[in-house]
């Protein structure tokens, strides 16, 4: 199936041009999405092109500026947040990135009633996290690893925690490993629905080994970056959850929430917190060996001013074939009875589906079923449940939004998006207003992305929010590559692939092939989304065929494929890329002497192992910021899939699955190894060890480091990186510059 929807091309072919590398590096063909910042059932905020903050009322059709660009500019604000009582706005400036999600910033509070900034008891700087209460205008913020509370923006702060210490104790914010591998947020505090209570996590990193690397900067001496970072098998952070009454914070102070006994008996993680009501909270815990998760529903005991988590309200989720959940353990979406909930987990056939849980997990009612997967529950109302899945037409790389009518029996299912713009849109997400009165649909492709507003009752489209007209016009004279998504059936395994073909592709000719791989557990590369990126350029201008293959270990096709890699990373992911390459050669249009593979991060690990597979299939390849040994990577991620690097667990495979162990096999390939020296995630150590092993084996290779760059290799490094990789591939494929 050809995914790029046909466009009316100018009949004069010579007005069409190929993509250039400059187009890609300049972001010439980037697209916009529109996510409303919902503030009620029918109102949302949006930052206009000229930087005014505008409030839109869908029902009256009116809009007005609540905050002018002049006010924003007066403090160089790059972000804002309206208090729920609409009296104040926080303005965020001096953004300073830390890790993937975390950053510090300076915050100013603007009083909308008098049009002035709040003076007196100003916020300290820089702040690590700040948020409004869900009702009114209380503020909670984290400064120097401690949590503070303000009843009103102009009030003096109440200090909730006192033990916060850099790299030692983190209150209300996660440490490195929790941020990257467990919470996927910059915060670790949660307001109750009406702002009565504030829950927060405390992470104790005192005993965690530290990764230290040089940051060269511009000074005479480099400085050393120290991060408590637990690698596989190392000591982990110790987590505790506390809840404080924000109305009378000094009365009893923070109260610790008890950990379920079956979890507390050995090393464990806290995985998420969900407020149900102001006096009921749901915590999810996970054993360090991540195949057992416990969901615990806790109630406030007015008489004792404590939180009680009865054993009868503990729900266990266990995997016998792999780890618990997908990438993360799913979170519950509670029903209006404030006790039962909807949750995605594996059904008896090994597909992730929505279940309804009331008394016990054993008595769960399965809501969706089939040989496809439910991916996200967006919203549950009194009569509808909205979710996304890849059910439609059996394409795992699609996402459509469905509505299940749960107010009647049997619940009826309707696909909201399947037939809206079928050629253009096959990959959606959604954003819902309060009570799902309205929602925005954001379509990511395969055609040009489009965002639309819909009535939550009838699903009628109300208006287009963003249709990327400028992008559509800009692409009119561009020869884009053709894209197709198909599958290979190999030994009872389905390998979905995306192939990107040169514009004038001719099956009777031979083309160089580049495999782009990620391949990490629970990832998906073959998706029906729009992209004009580096590989689009390589196909359009340089005449390469590019393929992406989802092999074993990838997501949304059932547990058999997903958990195939459990405790055995680096084996089947590589085998499946190789198998696909052989199938592509059989198709007849691939020049088997010009095949390359490249990947970044996990993809760098897979591409390195594929190059060192000894098959002779690959002429050359690139690894950007690869993992080289699972002993070097984060405990939370690595142990989820590999277990522990101990003799009585899985040390043998930890040792067998390193890139270094295969150094000899790089002798007959051209290898380009790339890494940022300030990579906090996949440490430069990984590439340093590959390089050392190659040198010790006297194997020639090419390398590039990016000084002071992290895992993303951003800014000017990006341009240098893609230019460098382009030269490398063109040389490998004997393409003239």
């Amino acid at each position: 199936i050809v995914l790029r929807p046909p466009r009316v091309h100018n009949s004069e072919e010579n007005t069409m041009r190929a993509l250039t590398l400059k187009d890609i590096l300049n972001g010439t063909f980037s697209y916009k999405t529109f996510f409303p910042n919902w503030i009620s059932g029918q109102e949302y905020l949006h930052q206009s092109a000229d930087n005014n903050i505008v409030l839109y009322n869908i029902e009256t059709g009116q809009s007005y500026t609540i905050l002018s660009n002049r006010t924003m500019k007066s403090v160089n604000a790059s972000n804002y947040g309206l208090s729920p009582d609409r009296q104040f706005v926080y303005l965020e400036s001096d953004y300073s990135k830390l890790w993937r999600y975390s950053y510090t910033a300076t915050y100013y509070i603007y009083d909308l009633s008098n049009g002035e900034f709040v003076r007196g008891n100003e916020l300290p700087r820089p702040i690590q996290y700040l948020c409004w209460s869900p009702v009114g205008s209380k503020l909670a913020y984290v400064y120097q690893n401690n949590i503070y509370l303000k009843q009103r923006p102009g009030d003096p702060p109440f200090q909730i925690t006192f033990n916060g210490r850099e790299n030692k104790i983190f209150n209300g914010i996660p440490d490195w490993v929790y941020e990257e591998e467990m919470l996927a947020t910059k915060y670790a505090l949660w307001w109750s629905p009406n702002g009565k209570f504030l829950a927060y996590a405390e992470f104790n990193d005192t005993d965690i080994p530290v990764i230290a690397y040089s940051y060269y900067g511009d000074e005479q001496y480099p400085r050393t970056i120290n991060i408590p970072y637990p690698k596989a098998g190392a000591k982990n952070p110790f987590v505790r959850i506390f809840i404080i009454d924000t109305t009378y914070p000094a009365y009893v102070g923070p109260q610790e929430v008890p950990v379920p006994a079956m979890i507390a008996s050995s090393d464990y993680y806290f995985s998420w917190l969900t407020w149900v009501t102001d006096e009921r909270v749901c915590l999810q815990w996970l054993k360090r060996v991540q195949n057992v998760s416990v969901l615990s529903i806790c109630d406030f005991r007015e008489d004792w001013q404590t939180w009680d988590c009865p054993k009868t309200q503990e729900h266990i989720e266990e995997s016998r074939t792999g780890w618990a959940g997908g990438f993360f353990v799913s979170t519950p979406v509670f029903s209006y009875d404030a006790i039962s909930y909807y949750k995605i987990f594996s059904d008896k056939d090994g597909y992730k589906h929505i279940h309804y849980i009331k008394d016990t997990v054993e008595n769960a009612i399965q809501i969706t079923s089939g040989k496809w997967e439910a991916i996200n529950i967006f919203r549950v109302t009194q009569d509808s449940l909205f979710y996304s899945s890849n059910e439609f037409e059996d394409y795992p790389g699609r996402r459509n939004i469905y509505r299940i009518s749960i107010g009647s029996y049997p619940p009826s299912k309707k696909c909201v998006t399947c037939h809206l713009r079928k050629e253009r849109c096959q990959y959606y997400t959604a954003s819902f207003s309060d009570y799902a009165k309205y929602y925005a649909l954001v379509c990511y492709g395969p055609g040009i992305p489009i965002s639309t507003l819909h009535d939550g009752r009838t699903d009628q489209e109300i208006k287009i929010l963003e249709e990327n007209k400028e992008l559509e016009n800009a692409l009119k004279n561009i020869q884009l590559p053709k894209e197709e998504i198909k599958k290979l059936e190999v030994d009872e395994i389905t390998l979905w692939y995306k192939m990107i073909l040169p514009p004038q592709f001719d099956r009777s000719k031979k083309y160089p092939l580049l495999i782009q791989v990620y391949g990490g557990p629970c990832s998906q590369s073959v998706r029906s989304v729009f992209a004009v990126n580096w590989i689009s350029y390589l196909a359009s201008k340089e005449g390469m065929v590019i393929a992406l293959v989802d092999g074993r270990g990838t997501a949304f096709q059932g547990d058999k494929l997903l958990y195939a890699v459990y405790r055995k990373l680096g084996v089947y992911e590589v085998e499946d890329q190789i198998t696909a390459v052989r199938k592509f050669i059989e198709m007849g249009f691939i020049d088997e002497k010009r095949i390359a593979i490249w990947g970044w991060s996990y993809g760098g690990y897979v591409s390195s192992l594929a190059l060192a597979s000894g098959t002779g299939l690959f002429k050359c390849g690139i690894a950007v910021a690869p993992v080289s040994s699972w002993e070097y990577y984060a405990s939370v991620y690595t142990e989820r899939f590999m277990g522990l690097p101990t003799k009585d667990d899985n040390l043998e495979h930890y040792k067998n699955s390193t890139v270094m162990a295969r150094a000899e096999y790089f002798r007959n390939v051209d290898y380009l190894l790339i890494h940022g020296t300030a990579d906090d995630n996949v440490h430069f150590q990984n590439s340093a060890q590959i390089a050392k092993a190659l040198v010790n084996a006297q194997v020639d290779f090419q390398a590039m480091w990016y000084s002071d760059q992290n895992h993303g290799l951003s800014g000017l490094s990006t341009n240098h990186l893609y230019t460098h990789m382009t030269h490398f591939l063109k040389q490998c494929f004997s393409l003239s510059d």
Epitope: Y336, I339, I406, Y409
Partner: antibody
Framework: EVQLLESGGGLVQPGGSLKLSCAAS????????MSWVRQAPGKGLEWIGE????????NYTPSLKDKFIISRDNAKNTLYLQMSKVRSEDTALYYC???????????????WGQGTTVTVSS | ELQMTQSPASLSASVGETVTITCRAS??????LAWYQQKQGKSPQLLVY???TLADGVPSRFSGSGSGTQYSLKINSLQPEDFGSYYC?????????FGGGTKLEIK
């Protein structure tokens, strides 16, 4: 008008078997969860079990699980209770009950039959 | 298995009076509770579900309340047709047990 009509009751010897039926009309039987409830002479109500519309979920009170079987035939709009290994304490008035779907995912017993009497005696 | 304890087992009241029947669950049933009325020689009739929602056609003098493990059924201004037996039943987890019943008699 909703009607549930139980039949099949009577005298049965200890250790014997009996099959009760409940004919439904006046509502969408094939979309309703159905239950059996019994009441011993002069005593209170005892829940026996329930069955969902497509018979994929059947729940029993633990003490009766091994001797009673609930089933249904949606084509005939009929609910069944197969009783086996009966004892004198199974003597009771047996009701079938059906109900409305209540959000979220449970069913109340909104309508009841008039009951059929089972007497276990030698 | 959750036990339902109903009290009182019996009570006498006059027409026009207000009475309250209580039901205690051996564990939290989270408002998944129904109340039934049964008149002599008749089948039970649903009065209340979700602990406090009146079933269709039930007079407003009946009201249900409670949470957690403690629930009650209140009948304001008793009418002659209100006399009979009353049962609570939980719907939290199977088996859906009934309370022992309360016999309401005319004084």
């Amino acid at each position: 008008e909703v009607q549930l009509l139980e039949s099949g009751g009577g005298l049965v010897q200890p250790g014997g078997s009996l099959k009760l039926s409940c004919a439904a009309s006046g509502f969408d039987f094939s979309r309703s969860w159905m239950s059996w409830v019994r009441q011993a002479p002069g005593k209170g109500l005892e829940w026996i079990g329930e069955i969902n519309p497509d018979s994929s979920t059947i729940n029993y009170t633990p003490s009766l699980k091994d001797k009673f079987i609930i089933s249904r035939d949606n084509a005939k709009n009929t609910l069944y209770l197969q009783m086996s290994k009966v004892r004198s304490e199974d003597t009771a008035l047996y009701y079938c009950a059906g109900g409305y779907y209540r959000y979220p995912y449970y069913y109340t017993m909104d309508y009841w039959g008039q009951g059929t009497t089972v007497t276990v005696s030698s | 298995e959750l036990q339902m304890t109903q009290s009182p087992a019996s009570l006498s009241a006059s027409v026009g009076e207000t009475v309250t029947i209580t039901c205690r669950a051996s564990g939290n049933i989270h408002n998944y509770l129904a109340w039934y009325q049964q008149k002599q020689g008749k089948s039970p009739q649903l009065l209340v579900y979700n602990a406090k929602t009146l079933a269709d056609g039930v007079p407003s003098r009946f009201s249900g309340s409670g949470s957690g493990t403690q629930y009650s059924l209140k009948i304001n201004s008793l009418q002659p047709e209100d006399f009979g037996s009353y049962y609570c039943q939980h719907f939290w987890s199977t088996p859906y047990t009934f309370g022992g019943g309360t016999k309401l008699e005319i004084k």
